[in-house]
């Protein structure tokens, strides 16, 4: 059974069949006699009740408000009301891209590794009984596939497979032909096997500090998604209330790996924070890598060669 239309803000492309299904549907069947009403408001118009007479494009069935099809002027707020239950949606109907078989904003993308198995399947369970054929297009060129009910691609990926795949379902309603499009963007990349994680920068860092001031030690690494980065310091981590581990930040690289950074913040630096090791470690199934920071009083810096300093 399909779920209800639970998202309160919805964007849809003009010219396609569309429906809103309220989320108290099971309840509605129990109270068949209860008055159920659909309303629309947009701009100056406040709560206009919808019924099949409002527009030849609108159909009402039990829990569903259908549009055959949805048009730009359907943009607005919609309300379903039944006893003390109300559900509201904000519908934004956007222009169809007249120069393409799909509208860019409605695309979902995934990365597939070369030589790995991937698939595209065309399904639409809500309109399933009304669909009389479905076509699959690649970059808006129709693919000749055996099954015209649920066309499918199942294969090991090659670089030539990269592109936009559009499933177009054709259906009849009241003697008119409609179509619904869903587009997938497939990007083919080189094999993305796990890398050996690496911490960025020198292995030993002397940091010049002043007593009573604060310092932020930044530890950055290139790692796999499941790898972890953490700080180790002192006898027992967490025993110094002036030392705080900040939240880890991660950014995905174009190759599907991660650039992670974790900051250790030391506030109100005291003597006990000087000349001790603050270790940052990245750990993976393939091993670990560690880099160390040592806080040195600014006055003592003359004794240390310049090339070992970090800011």
């Amino acid at each position: 059974a399909e779920s209800c239309t639970s998202r309160p803000h919805i964007t849809v492309v003009e010219g396609e069949p569309f429906y809103l299904k309220h989320c108290s549907c099971s309840l509605a069947h129990e109270i068949e006699t209860t008055t159920k009403s659909w309303y629309k408001s947009s701009g100056s118009q406040e709560h206009v009740e919808l019924n099949p007479r409002s527009s030849s494009r609108i159909a009402l069935h039990d829990c569903v408000l259908e549009f055959w099809p949805v048009e730009l002027n359907d943009t607005g707020s919609y309300f379903f009301q039944m006893k003390n239950y109300t559900q509201k949606w904000k519908l934004n109907v956007i222009r169809r891209n007249k120069h393409s078989c799909f509208t860019e904003r409605q695309v979902t993308s995934k990365i597939v590794e070369v030589k790995k198995f991937f698939q595209i399947t065309c399904e639409n369970s809500y309109y399933q009984t009304l669909v009389n054929s479905t076509s699959l297009y690649k970059n808006c060129k129709k693919l000749l596939l055996e099954n015209n009910k649920n066309p499918t691609i199942k294969k090991n990926a090659e670089f030539e497979d990269q592109g936009y795949y559009s499933c177009v379902h054709f259906l009849h309603h009241n003697g008119k032909l409609f179509n619904i499009t869903k587009t997938f963007n497939i990007t083919i990349v080189e094999d993305r096997s796990n890398i050996v994680p690496v911490l960025l920068g020198p292995k030993l860092n002397h940091v010049a500090v002043e007593l009573g001031k604060n310092v932020r030690l930044n530890c950055s690494a290139l790692l796999n998604e499941e790898d972890v980065i953490y700080w180790m310091f002192g006898e027992e981590n967490g025993s110094d209330p002036n030392i705080h581990e900040e939240k880890e930040m991660r950014i995905m690289t174009p190759e599907g790996k991660w650039h992670a950074s974790k900051v250790l913040r030391i506030e109100n630096i005291g003597e006990s924070n000087l000349n001790v090791l603050y270790n940052c470690t990245v750990a993976s199934t393939g091993g670990t890598d560690t880099k160390s920071f040592i806080l040195v009083r600014k006055a003592d810096m003359a004794d240390i060669p310049g090339h070992v300093f970090t800011r």
Epitope: E2, S3, C4, T5, S6, R7, P8, H9, I10, T11, K21, T108, S109, Q119, T121, C122, E123, N124, S125, Y126, C167, K182
Partner: nanobody, 120 residues
Framework: QVQLQESGGGSVQAGETLRLSCTAS????????MGWYRQAPGNKCELVST????????YYADSVKGRFTISQDNTKNTVYLQMNSLKPEDTGVYYC?????????????WGQGTQVTVSS
């Protein structure tokens, strides 16, 4: 446009656990509900679990209730599927999907997915 990236699959023994991750980029995370589908060899595509990025409400297929937990980390734009007490019948390719309506009626098993193999 939203870009989805699944990971975390693997081979385990029955009773063990796995955690799948799906990271969304290129769009505002809360524009979509996020979910997981799966497909076992020779079987149809099945909706396993979904989560609303607005209020955190969740759905689970009867076959995974009490064993699987879906969660989200909005700061990382990531949804996780924690799979505990895995059974051989959980074997299949798991696909992440984003739905901008919450109706979960338009496909689901597409792309490369992440393979989960559970042996007895």
């Amino acid at each position: 446009q939203v870009q989805l990236q699944e990971s975390g699959g693997g081979s385990v023994q029955a009773g063990e656990t796995l955690r799948l991750s799906c990271t969304a980029s290129g769009s505002t995370f809360d524009e979509y509900d996020m979910g997981w589908y799966r497909q076992a060899p020779g079987n149809k595509c099945e909706l396993v679990s979904t989560i609303s990025t607005i209020d955190g409400s969740t759905y689970y297929a009867d076959s995974v209730k009490g064993r699987f937990t879906i969660s989200q980390d909005n700061t990382k734009n990531t949804v996780y599927l924690q799979m505990n007490s895995l059974k051989p019948e959980d074997t299949g390719v798991y696909y992440c999907e984003a739905d901008d309506r919450g109706t979960w009626d338009r496909g689901g098993c597409w792309g490369q997915g992440t393979q989960v193999t559970v042996s007895s």
